[in-house]
Interface confidence: low
Amino acid sequence: APRGTQAEESPFVGNPGNITGARGLTGTLRCQLQVQGEPPEVHWLRDGQILELADSTQTQVPLGEDEQDDWIVVSQLRITSLQLSDTGQYQCLVFLGHQTFVSQPGYVGLEGLPYFLEEPEDRTVAANTPFNLSCQAQGPPEPVDLLWLQDAVPLATAPGHGPQRSLHVPGLNKTSSFSCEAHNAKGVTTSRTATITVLPQQPRNLHLVSRQPTELEVAWTPGLSGIYPLTHCTLQAVLSDDGMGIQAGEPDPPEEPLTSQASVPPHQLRLGSLHPHTPYHIRVACTSSQGPSSWTHWLPVETPEGVPLGPPENISATRNGSQAFVHWQEPRAPLQGTLLGYRLAYQGQDTPEVLMDIGLRQEVTLELQGDGSVSNLTVCVAAYTAAGDGPWSLPVPLEAWRPGQAQPVHQLVKEPSTPAFSWPWW
């Protein structure tokens, strides 16, 4: 066997003591050794593992004048703010030439009031809706028993008898406070107090009651709000843009919503100033003194088409012999829907009015029958959508065409001589 493996006397003349205390305690462990010759560096072990970043100081005192005389070496390990991770068995380690020496162990223990690893957090919950709260504490000493309190009233007869780490609350109808007490052999620690704010439940059954081209009437069913009456509900509408793709529960639409407040009851609201024939998405939330409910999902709705708000513009009507030329331009006023076409009405003095559907053309040539002797012939034009006819233009008299007057280029149309479209008095 190699030389130097025989048991030699330990150089340690002072071993680490024991420290037991509560969290946050500051303490010092101390090793002392006496060696001959150059003093070694002292390393500290915790549970056999070398402490790489130990807060240690080493003091070396020569006992003689010669370097080869004995030295006293003192190493002190400082533990600041004692934590659970600091607990364990501590030893000093030195290398002296051919030997490794380890001191007798000292022990660091933690013992005090319970320490919270997790405490109940403030939160909001909907009225009458179940939720859970968490609380976790540890010693030492163990065991640690928990006691939950609601509005300062214990929820069990004794610590450890009720719910422990997780408290299930089946629902609240008023804003309440919760805390937990942690009990061990050293005493009691109380957690922070969590405030659980009771908000109204999300409204249900948001639906359309009636539709107009520029307004929608909507209604909903309010959710429970506990002991707090609802003060108002807020409705938001946003243009869907026919492909914006707001899905159920998707966060927020891309543009600023139109927001309206409704006094409640009734749980109904007329949304005005909307665009006709336009898809929207709407949602609603209701508010009590404690705060607002969550929003409902976005509901897709659509305003219906309306009739055009104005007549066609720049109507001209001229006659040249047996032909009448009428042309016009699209209304400047909003169409409130998809333009499907134009209706034309004409009437002579002392003759009944006749209606014609012109379609989407903006001019028509009529083949007049007879000698055209009917006097004071007037023409009116109206635009129409699927919702119906818009306002008629003022009557425009049929004027005789004069040579040199511009005449529109158009397709000649000979209207069929069915009873609806014949002018038998000409």
Epitope: Q49, I50, E52
Partner: nanobody
Framework: QVKLEESGGGLVQAGGSLRLSCATS????????MAWFRQAPEKERDFVGF???????YYDDSVKGRFTISRDNAQNTVYLQMNSLKPEDTAVYYC???????????????WGQGTQVTVSS
């Protein structure tokens, strides 16, 4: 019984390099302090250095800057890379485990059988 086996020793000229290996029979390398010692003829065994459980290394002043200790946890092996060797580095090199046990109260190491390193001038 845990065994340690050193290898890699031999004859080398001054200024040369050698790499010693220390293989263990159990998975102790990652959790124990592994140390290298050397014993020259007619002398006491001297401490060379150690590698701690977290991978930190500590060297004796006589080898600092020339020797490097490393560890391969997967192979349960510790290495001693020796560069710029000098004739005074001639010795039998031993590796040792400093046990990570709760009853560690004295100088009870587990030793290998050693490997001879000879540095010629």
């Amino acid at each position: 019984q845990v065994k340690l086996e050193e290898s890699g020793g031999g004859l080398v000229q001054a200024g040369g390099s050698l790499r010693l290996s220390c293989a263990t029979s159990t998975r102790t390398v990652s959790s124990a302090v592994m140390a290298w010692f050397r014993q020259a003829p007619e002398k006491e065994r001297d401490f060379v250095g150690f590698i701690s459980n977290s991978g930190s290394v500590y060297y004796d002043d006589s080898v600092k800057g020339r020797f490097t200790i490393s560890r391969d946890n997967a192979q349960n092996t510790v290495y001693l890379q020796m560069n710029s060797l000098k004739p005074e580095d001639t010795a039998v090199y031993y590796c040792a485990i400093i046990w990570r046990t709760s009853d560690l109260t004295g100088r009870f190491n587990t030793w290998g059988q050693g490997t001879q390193v000879t540095v010629s001038s």
